[in-house]
């Protein structure tokens, strides 16, 4: 869907240069953003999100793919989101992360605080479109769940279903199969606490077609799991191997957009963990 042009996160084809090849990347409703909790608007009409079928993703293996920009898991269209204005069916999930020894890695930030990684679960409006690519060109054609990932004490079994297969897709364009697992466990427990705004794809072609849901609560993986994510994959097909790291876009200006919260803040400071 990116027109076959070459883009990277840094260097001559890096994100500063994206708008030259992908004009939409320079528009005024781009993602990711820094969500300042004291500036969001509480919307009492935002319901808790209902991920249907996430706990039963069928019996067919799921395709895991290193596309040189991220590691992506294809999802069956039996998974869909309730609690949104349209029926959005799942298409894929992927991750963004930093590099060893450096802070950051998530795309979105909450109160200017980044985490080590971020999971995106991408859905498209199946009432209106036949495929993800068709929907990606239209306003609110996509709905993406953003889950900030921090480091905790214990291994996250759900994320291990993905991370344990990374060695099979070390190089760009490699694919493998992953047995289906409970995808609901990838999400934070409190699905009722999230932020909602209109934004874009965070990679070229940066279409401004995304209804974003960024969860307030974080998911946790172990340090060992994070290091596996940071040190296993390569963005090149063969030698010389270039490690696939720091695949996150810089924060984009909010401009005139509103960010809505599904819950009332106890205070303006961001808290983690379960209540």
């Amino acid at each position: 869907a990116d027109g076959g042009q070459h883009w990277t996160y840094e260097g001559p084809h890096g994100q500063d240069h994206w708008p030259a090849s992908y004009p939409e990347c320079g528009n005024n409703a781009q993602s990711p953003i820094d969500i300042q909790t004291d500036s969001v608007t509480f919307d009492p009409d935002l319901p808790a999100l209902q991920p249907h079928g996430y706990d039963q993703p069928g019996t067919e293996p799921l395709d895991l793919h290193n596309n040189g920009h991220t590691v992506q898991l294809s999802l069956p269209s039996t998974l869909y989101l309730g609690g949104l204005p349209r029926k959005y069916v799942a298409a894929q999930l992927h991750l963004h992360w930093g590099q060893k020894g450096s802070p950051g890695g998530s795309e979105h930030q909450i109160n200017s605080e980044a985490t080590f990684a971020e999971l995106h679960i991408v859905h498209y409006d199946s009432d209106s479109y036949d495929s993800l690519s068709e929907a990606a060109e239209r306003p609110q054609g996509l709905a993406v769940l953003g889950i900030l990932i921090e480091v905790g004490e214990t291994k996250n079994i759900a994320y291990e279903h993905i991370l344990s297969h990374l060695h099979e897709v070390r190089h760009k364009d490699q694919k493998t199969s992953v047995p289906p697992f409970n995808l609901r466990e990838l999400l934070p427990k409190q699905l009722g606490q999230y932020f909602r705004y209109n934004g874009s794809l965070t990679t070229p072609p940066c279409y401004q077609s995304v209804l974003w849901t960024v969860f307030y609560r974080r998911s946790q993986i172990s340090m060992e799991q994070l290091e596996k994510l940071q040190g296993t994959l390569f963005s090149t097909e063969e030698e010389p191997s270039k490690l696939l790291v720091q695949n996150y876009r810089a924060l984009q200006p909010l401009n005139q957009r509103m960010v809505f919260a599904s819950f009332i803040q106890a205070g303006s400071s961001y808290t983690t963990g379960e209540m």
């Epitope: 036949d130 993800l132 690519s133």
Partner: antibody, heavy 115, light 112 residues
Framework: QVKLEQSGPELKKPGETVKISCKAS????????MHWVKQAPGKGLKWMGW????????TYADDFKGRFAFSLETSASIAYLQINNLKNEDTATYFC????????WGQGTTLTVSS | DIVMTQSTFSNPVTLGTSASISCRSS???????????LYWYLQKPGQSPQLLIY???NLASGVPDRFSSSGSGTDFTLRISRVEAEDVGVYYC?????????FGGGTKLEIK
């Protein structure tokens, strides 16, 4: 740029079979569904159905069930429309068109069925 | 099936003036999600159709803003604010609410 290039005009006899091709370029075939539309001479547009280019699963409108078949040659980025046991009333121009919104169209393939 | 009805010819219009083309559906095209699944296409003489409007009121890429569309759930109007010679052709409305997707019979825009 996105382009859908259809095969040339066809002259067939009743009872024969025709296979019309639609070559997609400027995008990945499997990223968008492909729809087919019929236009009889001097008439309007009629939606025939569509094919899921990822799975290969076709969906046909009732008037196009039976003798009509959509297929793909994904490696060559080509979608096909095959019509079996041709009848005179199949004489028309057939268009392939990308996506449910039909934002891009092929130039059309004129099929003449005559004895 | 949803039937889309259009008049065969528009009233002849003078270049530079506005024109309206109407379309009616046998069932409301307003989905519960708030989207109205009504589309407009223009087929110029000897050419393939081209998308003008999607989801009732959204201008397709590359279409001049002289074109606009509005309507209720069943009655729709395509407006051309300043008709140019290149606007001549047959205008089709279509619905994508339900299978089978259906087109109107087309309205031919004529110039005085």
């Amino acid at each position: 740029q996105v382009k859908l290039e259809q095969s040339g005009p066809e002259l067939k006899k009743p009872g024969e079979t025709v296979k019309i091709s639609c070559k997609a370029s400027g995008y990945t075939l499997t990223d968008y569904s492909m729809h087919w539309v019929k236009q009889a001479p001097g008439k309007g547009l009629k939606w025939m159905g569509w094919i899921n280019t990822e799975t290969g699963e076709p969906t046909y409108a009732d008037d196009f069930k039976g003798r009509f078949a959509f297929s793909l040659e994904t490696s060559a980025s080509i979608a096909y429309l095959q019509i079996n046991n041709l009848k005179n009333e199949d004489t028309a121009t057939y268009f392939c068109t990308r996506g449910r919104e039909r934002g891009f169209w092929g130039q059309g393939t004129t099929l003449t069925v005559s004895s | 099936d949803i039937v889309m009805t259009q008049s065969t010819f528009s009233n002849p219009v003078t270049l530079g003036t506005s024109a309206s083309i109407s379309c009616r559906s046998s069932k409301s095209l307003l989905h519960s999600n708030g989207i109205t699944y009504l589309y407009w296409y223009l087929q110029k003489p000897g050419q393939s159709p081209q998308l003008l409007i999607y989801q009732m009121s959204n201008l397709a890429s590359g279409v001049p803003d002289r074109f606009s569309s509005s309507g209720s759930g069943t009655d729709f109007t395509l407006r051309i604010s300043r008709v140019e010679a290149e606007d001549v052709g047959v205008y089709y409305c279509a619905q994508n609410l339900e299978l089978p997707y259906t087109f109107g019979g087309g309205t031919k825009l004529e110039i005085k």
